[in-house]
C-alpha cells in the first residue's frame, strides 16, 4: 500500500465547488446507515500535498500526542513513527504514555517500494476533527523504515482502513476501524472526499491547503451532488469491487471484463494513480493517445516519467478524453459508470525550471496486482465505504476539478449481463505468497 505508484498520493487545495447543484434524488436516502446530513466537525479534516498523501490529525496516548496520519483504504494496520527519523518532525513516544500496553510482538510490512517494521502495542486513540470518542486500538510503533516516510509530507503514520484479512502480521490484529465500531456506537461506515488541487501548488499554498474530508460514521450530503450509486464489495480484504466495462471517450475497450479485474480491482486512497493491469493499460493508452492525437507527447509521458507543460492557463483539456469505468450495480444485470476527466488523470506538478508553466504527469499507470482506483479516481467522487452493507458508493464530488464543458459523472443504470463472470478468482496459495503480492 505504499510508495512510487502506491502511496503516497496527492492532495492540495479543494477545487472550486460546483456552481450548479444537481437536484438530489431522494430514493436512497432511507437506505443510508448512520447519521445523515451534516458532519460539520469532520468536513475539511484532511490535508495533504500533491502526490504525498491525504492525512488526518489523530492523537495517541495519555496525555495525548498529536500526529498526522495518512488515510489509506488499501491497508489495514494503524502504524506510526515511534523513533527518530530524518523526515519526521515528531513521533509517538510510547514511554510518555501511561496507557500504552506492549503486545510483545513485532511486525514487518513491505510495499512495492519501501518497507517498515515495528513493535505492536495498544493505546488510546482519538480523532480531534472526528467523532467525539476515544478507543483503545492496536498500534504498530514503527522503529525501522526504508523509503516509507516522505521528506516534507507532514505525516508521521498511516491509518489502514481496510479489513483484518490483510492486516500484518496476521488477521488476528484488529484494524482501527473495527475497534472504533466495536467500542462505540458509531455506525460501520465512513466516507471520503479527496479534493485534488487541480493546479500546481507552490510551497506556501501546499502547506496551507485543505485536502478534503473523512466522514466517520455516515454520509455528509454537502460533499456531493446528484445521487449515490453503490457497487458491492466483492470480498472483505481490500475494498475489492468489480469493473464490468471500460470506455475512453465513450469508446468501449472491448476486452474480456475479467481482464479489468485481473487479479483484483480495489479502491485505494493510499495510491496516487489509476493503475491498470498490463493488457488494459496498453489498450487504454492506445485509445487515449488516439483521442489526443492533435498533440504529440513523448513516450516517457505515457509511462508517467516525463512532464508535459503548457503556458499557464492554456492546458488543452478538451483534447484529452474522459475515462469511464462501469461498476457492478447492486441489482442483478445492472451497472453504473463513473467518469473522470483529464483534470483528474493529469496530475499537476511544479516544474521548478519553468514555474510560469502548468506542468502535469500522466497518472494512469501499469500494475501487476490488478486495478487500483487511487486518488486519480477518488478525487472525482465522494466515496462511501459502507462496510455495514458491504458496498461502496460513488457520487460526483462537490470539490472535483472540472471546466465549463465537462464534469465528472456517476450515471446509471446500464444493463450488463453476466457481471459475476468479470471477477477473477485468485488460485488458493499459502498465506505468505498471498501477502507478498501487496503493492
Amino acid at each position: 500500500t505504499h510508495l512510487g505508484i502506491r502511496l503516497p498520493l496527492r492532495s492540495g487545495l479543494a477545487g472550486p465547488p460546483l456552481g450548479l447543484r444537481l437536484p438530489r434524488e431522494t430514493d436512497e436516502e432511507s437506505e443510508e446507515p448512520g447519521r445523515r446530513g451534516s458532519f460539520v466537525e469532520m468536513v475539511d479534516n484532511l490535508r495533504g500535498k500533491s502526490g504525498q498523501g491525504y492525512y488526518v490529525e489523530m492523537t495517541v496516548g495519555s496525555p495525548p500526542q498529536t500526529l498526522n496520519i495518512l488515510v489509506d483504504t488499501g491497508s489495514s494496520n494503524f502504524a506510526v513513527g515511534a523513533a527518530p527519523h530524518p523526515f519526521l518532525h515528531r513521533y509517538y513516544q510510547r514511554q510518555l504514555s501511561s496507557t500504552y500496553r506492549d503486545l510483545r510482538k513485532g511486525v514487518y510490512v513491505p510495499y512495492t517500494q519501501g518497507k517498515w517494521e515495528g513493535e505492536l502495542g495498544t493505546d488510546l486513540v482519538s480523532i480531534p476533527h472526528g467523532p467525539n470518542v476515544t478507543v483503545r486500538a492496536n498500534i504498530a510503533a514503527i522503529t525501522e523504515s526504508d523509503k516509507f516516510f516522505i521528506n516534507g509530507s507532514n505525516w508521521e503514520g498511516i491509518l489502514g482502513l481496510a479489513y483484518a484479512e490483510i492486516a500484518r502480521p496476521d488477521d488476528s490484529l484488529e484494524p482501527f476501524f473495527d475497534s472504533l465500531v466495536k467500542q462505540t456506537h458509531i455506525p460501520n461506515i465512513f466516507s471520503l472526499q479527496l479534493c485534488g488541487a487541480g493546479f500546481p501548488l507552490n510551497q506556501t499554498e501546499a502547506l496551507a491547503s485543505v485536502g478534503g474530508s473523512m466522514i466517520i460514521g455516515g454520509i455528509d450530503h454537502s460533499l456531493y451532488t446528484g445521487r449515490l450509486w453503490y457497487t458491492p464489495i466483492r470480498r472483505e480484504w481490500y475494498y475489492e469491487v468489480i469493473i464490468v466495462r471500460v470506455e475512453i471517450n465513450g469508446q468501449d475497450l472491448k476486452m474480456d471484463c475479467k481482464e479489468y479485474n485481473y487479479d483484483k480491482s480495489i479502491v485505494d486512497s493510499g495510491t496516487t494513480n489509476l493503475r491498470l493491469p498490463k493488457k488494459v493499460f496498453e489498450a487504454a493508452v492506445k485509445s487515449i493517445k488516439a483521442a489526443s492525437s492533435t498533440e504529440k507527447f513523448p513516450d516517457g509521458f505515457w509511462l508517467g516519467e516525463q512532464l508535459v507543460c503548457w503556458q499557464a492557463g492554456t492546458t488543452p483539456w478538451n483534447i484529452f478524453p474522459v475515462i469511464s469505468l462501469y461498476l457492478m450495480g447492486e441489482v442483478t444485470n445492472q451497472s453504473f459508470r463513473i467518469t473522470i476527466l483529464p483534470q483528474q488523470y493529469l496530475r499537476p506538478v511544479e516544474d521548478v525550471a519553468t514555474s510560469q508553466d502548468d506542468c502535469y504527469k500522466f497518472a494512469v499507470s501499469q500494475s501487476s496486482t490488478g486495478t487500483v482506483m487511487g486518488a486519480v479516481i477518488m478525487e472525482g467522487f465522494y466515496v462511501v465505504f459502507d462496510r455495514a452493507r458491504k458496498r461502496i458508493g460513488f457520487a460526483v464530488s462537490a470539490c472535483h476539478v472540472h471546466d465549463e464543458f465537462r464534469t465528472a459523472a456517476v450515471e446509471g443504470p446500464f444493463v450488463t449481463a453476466d457481471m459475476e463472470d468479470c471477477g477473477y478468482n485468485i488460485p488458493q496459495t499459502d498465506e505468505s505468497t498471498l501477502m507478498t503480492g501487496r503493492a
Epitope: R104, K105, Y108, P110, T143, E144, D146, P169, S432
Partner: antibody
Framework: EVQLLESGGGLVQPGGSLRLSCAAS????????MSWVRQAPGKGLEWVSA????????YYADSVKGRFTISRDNSKNTLYLQMNSLRAEDTAVYYC?????????????????WGQGTLVTVSS | EIVLTQSPATLSLSPGERATLSCRAS??????LAWYQQKPGQAPRLLIY???NRATGIPARFSGSGSGTDFTLTISSLEPEDFAVYYC?????????FGGGTKVEIK
C-alpha cells in the same frame, strides 16, 4: 566469507561488569540485524538480545533487561554487549549471530551464521 | 512468554532411518519458527526457517512443516553427520524463545 569473532569473555565476580565484542567481516555490517544468544554449560540455547541494522531498535530477554545493553558501531563493524550486575546464572558461552537482513521481523530474516562464542564465568 | 516444548528429549536411531522431531508452542507463533542443529563444541547452524523453508546449503533430506502451535522437523534418512542436538526457536513474540532441544543419537 562471513566471519564473526567474539571476545571479551572471562571470569568476573557477581555484581561485576563485562563488555563483549563481536568483530564482523565478509558482509556489509550495517545492512544486517545482529543478535546475542547464550548457552549455559550443558544446557540449551537462550536468546539474550537483538539489534536492528541501524541500531535504532533493541530488544532484550526479560532475564537481562535493565542489566545488559546491546549496541553496534557500524563504522567499526562491531557488535557489543555491555553486561552489568552480573549473576551466577549469567554464566554461559555467548554467541553473536548475523541476521538475514537489516530487519528483525522480515520473513526469512533468521540468525545465521553464528560466531564460535566466548565464555563468561560469573563466580566468586 | 511463549514456551516451546520439544519431544522427544532424546531420539535413538540408526543411520538410514527416518527421524521425526516435534516442537509444540504454548500459543500460536504463525510460521515464525526455525530449526537449528548444534554439534558438540560447535555453534548452532540454521536448518529450516519460517517453519518449512530450507536454509542455504541444507540437504533435501531435512524438511520442516507445521504452523500455529505444532511443528515438525523430519530427517528422511539419517546420515552419520546428522547425529546432533536440534533446537526450535520462535520469533513471533518477545522474548524470542528456544525449545529445550532434542538429541538425536546413534542407536
Amino acid at each position: 566469507e562471513v566471519q564473526l569473532l567474539e571476545s571479551g569473555g572471562g571470569l568476573v565476580q557477581p555484581g561485576g561488569s563485562l563488555r563483549l565484542s563481536c568483530a564482523a567481516s565478509g558482509f556489509t555490517f550495517s545492512s544486517y540485524a545482529m543478535s546475542w544468544v547464550r548457552q549455559a554449560p550443558g544446557k540449551g540455547l537462550e536468546w539474550v538480545s537483538a539489534i536492528s541494522g541501524s541500531g535504532g531498535s533493541t530488544y532484550y530477554a526479560d532475564s537481562v533487561k535493565g542489566r545488559f545493553t546491546i549496541s553496534r558501531d557500524n563504522s567499526k563493524n562491531t557488535l557489543y554487549l555491555q553486561m552489568n550486575s552480573l549473576r551466577a546464572e549469567d554464566t554461559a558461552v555467548y554467541y553473536c549471530a548475523k541476521g538475514g537482513s537489516q530487519w528483525l521481523y522480515a520473513p526469512g530474516s533468521w540468525f545465521d551464521p553464528w560466531g564460535q562464542g566466548t565464555l563468561v564465568t560469573v563466580s566468586s | 512468554e511463549i514456551v516451546l516444548t520439544q519431544s522427544p528429549a532424546t531420539l535413538s536411531l540408526s543411520p538410514g532411518e527416518r527421524a521425526t522431531l516435534s516442537c509444540r508452542a504454548s500459543q500460536s507463533v504463525s510460521s515464525y519458527l526455525a530449526w537449528y542443529q548444534q554439534k558438540p563444541g560447535q555453534a548452532p547452524r540454521l536448518l529450516i526457517y519460517d517453519a518449512s523453508n530450507r536454509a542455504t546449503g541444507i540437504p533435501a533430506r531435512f524438511s520442516g512443516s507445521g504452523s500455529g502451535t505444532d511443528f515438525t522437523l523430519t530427517i528422511s534418512s539419517l546420515e552419520p553427520e546428522d547425529f546432533a542436538v536440534y533446537y526450535c526457536v520462535q520469533r513471533s513474540n518477545f522474548p524470542w524463545t528456544f525449545g529445550g532441544g532434542t538429541k538425536v543419537e546413534i542407536k
